[in-house]
C-alpha cells in the first residue's frame, strides 16, 4: 500500500523536516530557517512561533517541531500553549485590577496565581477545626467534637486540607 501511495503521490515520501517543493519538480526540500514540518508529506513548512517580550523560549524551534514559550520569571501562563502571561502574586494574595492584594479574612491562596478561596467549613462535615486557617493555608479539620469526648475509643486522624475544586488550566 505504501508503495502504491508513493507512486500516486511523490510527496508522501517527504519526511518531517522537509516539504514537497512544487517549484522543484516535487522533490523534498528542507524546511527554510524559522519553519518546521512535524509530519511527512507536507507541501509547506509552518512558521515557527516566536517567544519575545514577556514570553521566553522554553523549547527552540527545530525543523521537525515548533518552538514552545513560557513566561518570564514573575509571570505564569494563561491559556493552552501559553497564549498570555499574568503577573505572579505571593501566597496569601490574589491579582486584582489594582495589583496583588492580600486575601480577605476567611479566605486563602496557597499559590502564586489564582484567586483567594474560602476556608473549608469543618462543621459541614461534622468535624472541628484542628489548625486555624491563614491567608496562605486552609484550615485543617480534625475529629468531630463527639470523638474527643472522654472514653472515646479511637481518634480519627486529621483529614488532609481539602483543595477546593478548580478547573485545570
Amino acid at each position: 500500500f505504501e508503495r502504491t501511495r508513493s507512486l500516486q503521490d511523490p510527496c508522501s515520501n517527504c519526511p518531517a523536516g522537509t516539504f514537497c517543493d512544487n517549484n522543484r519538480n516535487q522533490i523534498c526540500s528542507p524546511c527554510p530557517p524559522n519553519s518546521f514540518s512535524s509530519a511527512g508529506g507536507q507541501r509547506t513548512c509552518d512558521i515557527c512561533r516566536q517567544c519575545k517580550g514577556v514570553f521566553r523560549t522554553r523549547k527552540e524551534c527545530s525543523s521537525t517541531s515548533n518552538a514552545e514559550c513560557d513566561c518570564t520569571p514573575g509571570f505564569h501562563c494563561l491559556g493552552a500553549g501559553c497564549s498570555m502571561c499574568e503577573q505572579d502574586c505571593k501566597q496569601g494574595q490574589e491579582l486584582t485590577k489594582k495589583g496583588c492584594k492580600d486575601c480577605c479574612f476567611g479566605t486563602f491562596n496557597d499559590q502564586k496565581r489564582g484567586i483567594c478561596r474560602p476556608w473549608t467549613n469543618c462543621s459541614l462535615d461534622g468535624k472541628s477545626v484542628l489548625v486555624n486557617g491563614t491567608k496562605e493555608r486552609d484550615v485543617v479539620c480534625g475529629p468531630s467534637p463527639a470523638d474527643l469526648s472522654p472514653g472515646a475509643s479511637s481518634v480519627t486522624p486529621p483529614a488532609p486540607a481539602r483543595e477546593p475544586g478548580h478547573s485545570p488550566q
Epitope: V54, C71, G74, M84
Partner: antibody, heavy 115, light 107 residues
C-alpha cells in the same frame, strides 16, 4: 490600577519627526514592556513595534528605517519617535502593555500630519 | 508577514440574534489569536485570547473557537452594547498583525 496614557503634539508637519510619550502607572517598567500600535482613521490596526522590559526593541519592517522606541524609567514613560512623516502617518497612536495579548491599552492620541 | 482576513466586512443583525464572525490566517498560527471589540473614540478591548479563552470580566455570551488558520468569534445573544467593530489579531509571529475588522451594526 493599570493605566497607560499617550501624549504629544496633535499636529506634525510633513518630513518632521512625530514624538509621542506613553506615561504608565500601576505597573513597573522594569517588569513589563510596551507595544506601539496605530490606526488610520476608519481603518484597521497596525503594529509599529515594541520595547521589552530589558530595554531591547523589535520593529515592524515597514517602519524600521524611521522608528525609535525608548524608555525612561525615572519618568515612568515610554516614547515613540517616527521620522520623515507624511500624510500617510496620520492616525490614532496607541501604546499597549506587553502581556502576550494586549489586555491593557492607552486611550490613544490622534496625530495629524499636515502643513 | 501573516495576513488575517476577516469576514464579513459588515454584519447587520438585531439584538437577541446570534453573531458569527470569521478570521482566516494566511499561515498556521496555532491558537495564538485574540479578538478585540472597539467602539467609536475608544481603544480596542480584549475579549478573547488564545483563540478560545474569555478575558477577565467578559460576558459568557462571547466565545471563540478555531486553530491553525480558521477562527470564529460567536456572540450568542446580541445585546445593544455589542454593536461595534471587532478585530482579530495574531500573537504568534512578528510582525504582529490584525485583521481589517468586522463592523457589527444594528439591523
Amino acid at each position: 490600577q493599570v493605566q497607560l496614557q499617550e501624549s504629544g503634539p496633535g499636529l506634525v508637519k510633513p518630513s518632521q519627526t512625530l514624538s509621542l510619550t506613553c506615561t504608565v502607572s500601576g505597573f513597573s517598567l522594569t517588569t513589563y514592556g510596551v507595544h506601539w500600535i496605530r490606526q488610520h482613521p476608519g481603518k484597521g490596526l497596525e503594529w509599529i513595534g515594541a520595547i521589552w522590559s530589558g530595554g531591547s526593541t523589535d520593529y515592524n519592517a515597514a517602519f524600521i528605517s524611521r522608528v525609535t522606541i525608548s524608555v525612561d524609567t525615572s519618568k515612568n514613560q515610554f516614547s515613540l519617535k517616527l521620522s520623515s512623516v507624511t500624510a500617510a502617518d496620520t492616525a490614532v497612536y496607541y501604546c499597549a502593555r506587553d502581556d502576550g495579548s494586549f489586555a491593557n491599552w492607552g486611550q490613544g492620541t490622534l496625530v495629524t500630519v499636515s502643513s | 508577514e501573516i495576513v488575517l482576513t476577516q469576514s464579513p466586512g459588515t454584519l447587520s443583525l438585531s439584538p437577541g440574534e446570534r453573531a458569527t464572525l470569521s478570521c482566516k490566517a494566511s499561515e498556521n498560527v496555532g491558537t495564538y489569536v485574540s479578538w478585540y471589540q472597539q467602539k467609536p473614540g475608544q481603544a480596542p478591548r480584549l475579549l478573547i485570547y488564545g483563540a478560545s479563552n474569555r478575558y477577565t470580566g467578559i460576558p459568557d455570551r462571547f466565545s471563540g473557537s478555531g486553530s491553525g488558520t480558521d477562527f470564529t468569534l460567536t456572540i450568542s445573544r446580541l445585546e445593544p452594547e455589542d454593536f461595534a467593530v471587532y478585530y482579530c489579531g495574531q500573537t504568534y509571529s512578528y510582525p504582529l498583525t490584525f485583521g481589517q475588522g468586522t463592523r457589527l451594526e444594528i439591523k
